[in-house]
Interface confidence: low
Amino acid sequence: TPEVWVQVQMEATELSSFTVHCGFLGPGSISLVTVSWGGPDGAGGTKLAVLHPELGTRQWAPARQARWETQSSISLALEDSGASSPFANTTFCCKFASFPEGSWESCGSLPPSSDPGLSAPPTPVPILRAD
């Protein structure tokens, strides 16, 4: 069964910078990745970035840079502008659309006790949402 993992990390050198890493574990090719915060995309979450392997990427503030790390994983850099966007307490969700499996989504957040530079452990179990 395909799975999606999510890691959120705070940059050690820049406490206002966060990076979300997401990956897809499973067969098939990725057709689209959507990253959202505050919940799943279209279900209370706000879209931060859309990455397409051929058409490119698009991101929305406060996302700073979305990029592919491998053919099945992406990273999204975020700029925390202060109290209005408390990333430390926010849930980030990544949805991978793959052919022929469908869509798989998982969410993760920065652990409350995490030190700068440490990342949250991968979230092994996806939200039960296969479109």
Partner: antibody, heavy 129, light 107 residues
């Protein structure tokens, strides 16, 4: 060509619930790829976004109205509806329904053309006893 | 929510002249900004989306520019049908928010 048409009573009494329906023609709500929104405009004033619904039933509301708003969808009738409870004279406005673009969930290909590209002609609702 | 502020409130321009309308966001909206035109008794019409892309059927005298928090709508040579109210709207975050509008009137 997609067209939207609002319908509902033009006069609502204070404290009652305002109910409007938007009928979509020339395209299917359930094809996905769009947010279906309600926007209102007070007399002589600017535009205020009320909320949206996705064909799946997912909704998002303006925090200033959230406690009073319900937006629902009926894909079998190709309609989406607005209910605004406990209305007062301050809810007197022209109410518009509109289509707000998103990426195409069917193909998985983004459409980089965001914005409310199709609007209904608007319906005037007056709150008065 | 993101507050959108438009200036000026009213712009008096002669036909054939250039009109420049400004829109400021209270925080960055990247390039996710749309412009709408509204005439009396009509629904708004989408002119520009994603800061600078003209919607279908919009003449090239309309152009958008800017990024982040500062945006501009330019009408290069005003035609009689361009006198209307113009609204900016951010589509970066929910809730969608609009500016209060700029009325372009005949000088």
């Amino acid at each position: 060509q997609v067209q939207l048409q609002e319908s509902g009573p033009g006069l609502v009494k204070p404290s009652q619930t305002l109910s409007l329906t938007c009928t979509v023609s020339g395209g299917s709500i359930s094809s996905g790829g769009y947010y279906w929104s309600w926007i209102r405009q007070h007399p002589g004033k600017g535009l205020e976004w009320i909320g949206y619904i996705y064909y799946s039933g997912s909704t998002s509301y303006n925090p200033s109205l959230k406690s009073r708003v319900t937006i629902s969808v009926d894909t079998s009738k190709n309609q989406f509806s607005l209910k605004l409870s406990s209305v007062t004279a301050a809810d007197t406005a022209v109410y518009y329904c509109a289509r707000d673009l998103d990426y195409d969930i069917l193909t998985g290909y983004p459409r980089w053309d965001y914005g409310m590209d199709v609007w209904g002609q608007g319906t005037t609702v007056t709150v008065s006893s | 929510e993101i507050v959108m502020t438009q200036s000026p409130a009213t712009l008096s321009v002669s036909p054939g002249e250039r009109a420049t309308l400004s829109c400021r966001a209270s925080q960055s909206v990247s390039n996710n900004l749309a412009w709408y035109q509204q005439k009396p008794g009509q629904a708004p019409r989408l002119l520009i989306y994603s800061e600078s892309t003209r919607a279908t059927g919009i003449p090239d005298r309309f152009s958008g520019s800017g990024s982040g928090t500062e945006f501009t709508l330019t009408i290069s040579s005003l035609q009689s049908e361009d006198f209307a109210v113009y609204y900016c709207q951010q589509h970066n975050n929910w809730p969608r928010t609009f500016g209060q509008g700029t009325k372009v009137e005949i000088k």
